[in-house]
């Protein structure tokens, strides 16, 4: 079944290469198990940035080597992506799946354009 997913249109990453945004979904039922996936679209290619499955009320658990962290509160997921560089600029899309109990629901947001600007190197102090 379809499910609406909302996310901000634009986010600017910090000078340390960290970008955060909220992914909010309109849950049609009382899901207990939710899967959140962050996709990146750039140059006619879609790749999976990270994904986490969590039980409602519990923390999101990404893989140890993931560049993503997140917390959940109700139907909102606060996502943080770190280690970003200018070349990582692109459209980051939130995909939410309500896995359990049935029926399965799927929603995909319109994407958040994340702009990353590499910091200027500090000039040598002679």
């Amino acid at each position: 079944k379809a499910m609406h997913v909302a996310q901000p249109a634009v986010v600017l990453a910090s000078s340390r290469g960290i970008a955060s945004f909220v992914c909010e979904y309109a849950s049609p039922g009382k899901a207990t198990e939710v899967r959140v996936t962050v996709l990146r679209q750039a140059d006619s290619q879609v790749t999976e940035v990270c994904a986490a499955t969590y039980m409602m009320g519990n923390e999101l658990t990404f893989l140890d080597d993931s560049i993503c962290t997140g917390t959940s509160s109700g139907n909102q997921v606060n996502l943080t992506i770190q280690g970003l560089r200018a070349m990582d600029t692109g459209l980051y899309i939130c995909k939410v799946e309500l896995m359990y109990p049935p029926p399965y629901y799927l929603g995909i947001g319109n994407g958040t354009q994340i702009y990353v600007i590499d910091p200027e190197p500090c000039p040598d102090s002679d």
Partner: nanobody, 130 residues
């Protein structure tokens, strides 16, 4: 529960034609994207053609002018008319539903577009060989 059932595949000679069908049930989308994907042996799944709820269609460059996607809303059925078939069209063909029409038109020429779709049929095999 959403169900997609494909049919119409088979063995056809190069230059021949086939019409694939996908019967859909159990979904209630006011706005969505329907698509045909294919997966050749040893390769990834690629989007072939899509159609949105308004009837706008899109095709992969490799099938443009040969394949035609259409839908019958009354029958909840998606079709793919395939003409001038080539050996490189040999693959398992899947129909799929994507919940966000924003990604519909670009899907056939986007690698990894399957991420935008969440419901899949079991597939139907198309073999083009003499």
């Amino acid at each position: 529960e959403v169900q997609l059932v494909e049919s119409g595949g088979g063995l056809v000679q190069p230059g021949g034609s086939l019409r694939l069908s996908c019967a859909a049930s159990g979904y209630t989308y006011s706005r969505h994207c329907l698509g045909w994907f294919r997966q050749a042996p040893g390769k990834g799944r690629e989007a072939v053609s899509t159609i949105d709820s308004g009837g706008s269609t899109s095709y992969a460059d490799s099938v443009k002018g040969r394949f035609t996607i259409s839908r019958d809303n009354a029958k909840n059925t998606l079709y793919l008319q395939m003409n001038s078939l080539r050996p490189e069209d040999t693959a398992v063909y899947y129909c799929a539903i994507g919940p966000n029409p924003r990604y519909c038109s670009g899907a056939p020429n986007t690698r990894g577009a399957e991420h935008y779709f969440g419901y899949w049929g079991q597939g139907t095999l198309v073999t083009v060989s003499s």
